[in-house]
């Protein structure tokens, strides 16, 4: 079982060899496409392969902002050829992510296919790591192999790579081990209850608030740190402001997501950026502690 997601992929190529990907769609090249063309081939060691975000079967929704559906395959290929002359292309790609059934806590293994020059899409953090503490996955690149498995998420502890324990391994060494892996990488992962935002911890409730700003401010101040796993919380509400008027948001509430983008593993600066680009309707996923200790 899978669900689909979309991501933007930027490739740098050249007029001679292009970007290293082939598309197919429709029945013939001059026919109007009724569904997006598919990536049918990725050339080894090409920009398309090295980016690590494209796979055969992905649907290309747009090329440099121009929708592929309702165009022809010839037009799509021409857009790629033109982009190669400019050395750069921006693709909007739809892909499948596995709906993995995984426990919210515990230790398990994840196997990921790996090519030498291709990143898995995992960022590991050693921020505020004490001796003997595990490395933490701080980010997973959208569209990457790691993302498509559906099993990994920011906050997961990375215990071992290909049976090499990482207990006292410096982050730089772990990154190097990951880079050098080929074919199939086996990651030993630990998920902790406190990493699961979805899991409603004792005395806490999660809910979503939709704010329509109508051109005005949201009326909230948020605080946190640049440490990936420090919580982002509401630190202030403008008196009679939009957020306060809802009656659903209070100082001390934790923000879990902004417009369905999880803040897990994201620093304060990214949360602020997400709010800035959120548009007219802003959806906040809030976690409220009900029985705050005195």
């Amino acid at each position: 079982i899978v669900h689909t997601e979309t991501t933007e992929v930027v490739l740098c190529g050249d007029p001679l060899s292009g970007f290293g990907l082939q598309l197919q769609g429709g029945i013939f090249a001059t026919e109007t496409l009724s569904s997006p063309p598919l990536v049918c081939f990725i050339e080894p060691d090409s920009p398309a392969e090295r980016c690590g975000l494209l796979q055969v079967g992905d649907r290309v929704l747009s090329i440099n902002g121009i929708a592929t559906e309702d165009g022809t395959m010839e037009e799509a290929n021409q857009l790629l050829r033109d982009a190669a002359l400019a050395h750069k292309v921006v693709l909007e790609v739809e892909f499948d992510v596995a709906e993995s059934v995984i426990p919210s806590s515990g230790t398990f293994h994840v196997k990921l296919p790996k090519k030498r020059s291709v990143e898995l899409g995992i960022t590991i953090s050693s921020a505020s790591r004490k001796r003997g503490e595990p490395l933490i996955i701080s980010d997973i690149k959208k569209g990457s192999v790691a993302h498509r498995t559906g099993t990994l998420e920011p906050g997961d502890k990375l215990l071992a790579i290909d049976n090499i324990r990482l207990d006292n391994c410096p982050m730089e060494d772990a990154v190097q081990i990951l880079r050098q892996c080929e074919d199939l990488v086996k990651l030993k992962i630990r998920k902790d209850e406190d990493n699961s935002d979805e899991l409603e911890t004792t005395g806490a409730v999660s809910y979503t608030v939709e704010l329509k700003r109508y051109g005005g401010p949201l009326g909230i101040t948020i605080s946190g740190t640049e440490e990936p796993f420090d919580p982002i919380v509401i630190s202030g509400l403008t008196k009679r402001g939009l957020a306060e008027r809802t009656g659903a948001i209070h100082v001390g509430d934790r923000i879990l997501a902004i417009n369905n983008v999880s803040l897990k593993g994201r620093p304060l600066s990214e949360a602020i950026h997400l709010l800035q680009v959120a548009g007219e309707t802003v959806t906040l996923k809030i976690k409220k502690q009900l029985d705050r200790p005195l």
Epitope: G25, S35, L38, G57
Partner: antibody
Framework: EVQLLESGGGLVQPGGSLRLSCAAS????????MSWVRQAPGKGLEWVSA????????YYADSVKGRFTISRDNSKNTLYLQMNSLRAEDTAVYYC????????WGQGTLVTVSS | DIQMTQSPSSLSASVGDRVTITCRAS??????LNWYQQKPGKAPKLLIY???SLQSGVPSRFSGSGSGTDFTLTISSLQPEDFATYYC????????FGQGTKLEIK
């Protein structure tokens, strides 16, 4: 593993009808256009008909236009070819093939039109 | 409709030979040309797509070239398993196939 499996062929009299099916597995069926291609005994390949991934667009060779209807059921991962007013010259092995590059083919099903 | 003309219609060659089959379109089809191999009693198999791209799993002795109206399939060193019938097919407009080239053992 991508697999295409045709069925429904057989012996039919001129003027008769037959419905061919092609069961697909191993790929996202709805993302691909599909074609029917036929091959008369001892002859070359002839494209018959094609349908877009959504089923919204259909195309036919002039030789079968008005007599054959292509369709698909994406929920069943199955492609169909309804053949009416069959003629002796429609006798052939019928293959289904995937996509504009026809990168995967079924094993074929024989349709014989004879009295 | 776009007509595809293949030549030769039959060809005798020996193992190890370099073989070239040509295909001509009745109008420009850019690079929308595919090559297939078919053995008796079997379904066709895609060898080359988009004029020069080698299909996954196909030996590198097969290569394709050309654009516009003139295209070539080359087998650099014939192997015993290469004796078969080869078809070109355009996908620029509604698909059409060449009449086929039968490659036989000399």
């Amino acid at each position: 593993e991508v697999q295409l499996l045709e069925s429904g062929g057989g012996l039919v009299q001129p003027g008769g009808s037959l419905r061919l099916s092609c069961a697909a597995s191993g790929f996202t069926f709805s993302s691909y256009a599909m074609s029917w291609v036929r091959q008369a005994p001892g002859k070359g390949l002839e494209w018959v008909s094609a349908i877009s991934g959504s089923g919204g667009s259909t195309y036919y060779a002039d030789s079968v236009k008005g007599r054959f209807t292509i369709s698909r059921d994406n929920s069943k991962n199955t492609l169909y070819l309804q053949m009416n007013s069959l003629r002796a010259e429609d006798t052939a092995v019928y293959y289904c093939a995937r996509g504009s590059y026809m990168d995967y083919w079924g094993q074929g099903t024989l349709v014989t039109v004879s009295s | 409709d776009i007509q595809m003309t293949q030549s030769p219609s039959s060809l005798s060659a020996s193992v190890g030979d370099r073989v070239t089959i040509t295909c001509r379109a009745s109008q420009s089809i850019s690079s929308y040309l595919n090559w297939y191999q078919q053995k008796p009693g079997k379904a066709p198999k895609l060898l080359i797509y988009a004029a020069s791209s080698l299909q996954s799993g196909v030996p590198s002795r097969f290569s394709g070239s050309g654009s516009g109206t003139d295209f070539t399939l080359t087998i650099s060193s014939l192997q015993p398993e290469d004796f078969a019938t080869y078809y070109c097919q355009q996908s620029y407009g509604p698909p059409t196939f060449g009449q086929g080239t039968k490659l036989e053992i000399k």
